[in-house]
Interface confidence: low
């Protein structure tokens, strides 16, 4: 018998059929059944927690307390619901070891020297713009640095091609209008080759092929890490090199960083569907 709903987890939700809820009222739909905004559905003797969030596609990235980046706060809450575990927003902008890199996603991103604006005039600033009340005419300032962002051409909703998602965000900020990713590759002439993986997501083949080659060469020189390094790599395998004192991480596809703790946005995974794109 399960001790909690998490013991009944399925890929789409939680299914706890076949339990007598007169003996164990844990599986009744009440306010405590589905945590983290899950919707509790009771069909016959089955209780299921469903996480069907209607998240918009705004790219307002946040970093979760699990070290993962999300397209916006709604997707973070959806992940918390699916995992049935608490994920807090720890900072605005994608997770980065260098917290002071200044992506411009938050009011205090970067050096931290900008002053907090208190008045409602700042409410007009949208799409990642920061408010500068000291400016004489333009209050909304776009302090978005895309210089460190990898090349990953995209076609945006304004009909223009951009080198990466960051540039789309920058354009959206500068124009103060909603500009979204429409498709992978440049507009009309889509040069980026995509391949569909088993889970129905699309990924760049050039990246996947390179990753496989790197993976093969890495295996030759590395041995598994000692047991006390469990958890050293968040999204990848821990390997110990004979030449190195510190272990290293071989990251799963789509992750980067010393501990595979960061989402790698050089690979854009896209959920197929009518103009509904999602970073996952």
């Amino acid at each position: 018998f399960p001790t909690s709903l998490s013991d009944c987890q399925t890929p789409t939700g939680w299914n706890c059929s076949g339990y007598d809820d007169r003996e164990n009222d844990l599986f009744l739909c009440d306010t405590n059944t589905c945590k983290f905004d899950g919707e509790c559905l009771r069909i016959g003797d089955t209780v299921t927690c469903v996480c069907q969030f209607k998240c918009n596609n705004d790219y307002v990235p946040v970093c979760g307390s699990n070290g993962e980046s999300y397209q916006n706060e709604c997707y973070l809450r959806q992940a918390a619901c699916k995992q049935q575990s608490e994920i807090l927003v720890v900072s605005e902008g994608s997770c980065a070891t260098d917290a002071g890199s200044g992506s411009g996603d938050g009011v205090h991103e970067g050096s931290g020297e900008t002053s907090q604006k208190e008045t409602s005039t700042c409410d007009i600033c949208q799409f990642g713009a920061e408010c500068d009340e000291d400016a004489e005419d333009v209050w909304c300032v776009c302090n978005i640095d895309c210089s460190q962002t990898n090349f990953n051409p995209l076609c945006a909703s304004d009909g223009k091609s951009y080198d990466n998602a960051c540039q789309i965000k920058e354009a959206s900020c500068q124009k103060q209008e909603k500009i979204e990713v429409m498709s992978l590759g440049r507009c009309q002439d889509n040069t980026t080759t995509t391949t569909k993986s088993e889970d129905g997501h699309y990924a760049r083949t050039d990246y996947a092929e390179n990753a496989n080659k790197l993976e093969e060469s890495a295996r030759e020189h590395h041995i598994p890490c000692p047991e006390h390094y469990n958890g050293f790599c968040m999204h990848g395998k821990c390997e110990h090199s004979i030449n190195m004192q510190e272990p290293s991480c071989r990251c799963d596809a789509g992750y980067t960083g010393q501990h595979c703790e960061k989402k790698d946005y050089s690979v854009l995974y896209v959920v197929p569907g009518p103009v509904r794109f999602q970073y996952v």
Epitope: L88, S91, D98, H108, E118, M234
Partner: antibody
Amino acid sequence: DVQLQESGPGLVKPSQSLSLTCSVTGYSITSGYYWSWIRQFPGNKLEWMGFISYDGSNKYNPSLKNRISITRDTSENQFFLNLRSVTTEDTATYYCARGLRRGDYSMDYWGQGTSVTVSS
Amino acid sequence: DIVMTQSQKFMSTSVGDSVSITCKASQNVVTAVAWYRQKPGQSPKLLIYSASNRHTGVPDRFTGSGSGTDFTLTINNMQSEDLADYFCQQYSSYPFTFGGGTKLEIK
């Protein structure tokens, strides 16, 4: 400039309730941010007690969950701490503070603190 | 709860020196760490947020670094007004927790 000011009784008897008020000036508590209560015990240990957010939702420290409630009066721009069934171990300096920004729960504005002694 | 450990309860230093205060989290807190300075009889003041971002008005002699579980606050060119208690705080998960504090004293 944003200012926070705690007020309330300095002496509370054991088993009674402790009620403190945080008055905020320079910013509306409904406009944004998270409004926390933190206490500092003799010996300087700090404990986050909980917050009320701009939208009125709460988060509490589980160690206090059955005894604590944080409420607000938006018309007076104040938020309140109520701690039930106090013991001598609740003797501390109580601070109210504001979270730095959405998505960052470090605290940039603090009140000057109010000392509370629990004694019969 | 995540435990924040400041192993040095007291540290002795001299004006003009550099000093590094460390804080260790019992589990990965990404970069969700803040540092505060508290002078006697005053409330804590925010110095660093998100592990390495200086808060508005904080002198650049204060530097925060680290991610995951190990964090450091470095004070360069130590000034007499820096003699105080320093606390780290994690806000990666509820409940938010503080380190026990490190008191900087004059040698």
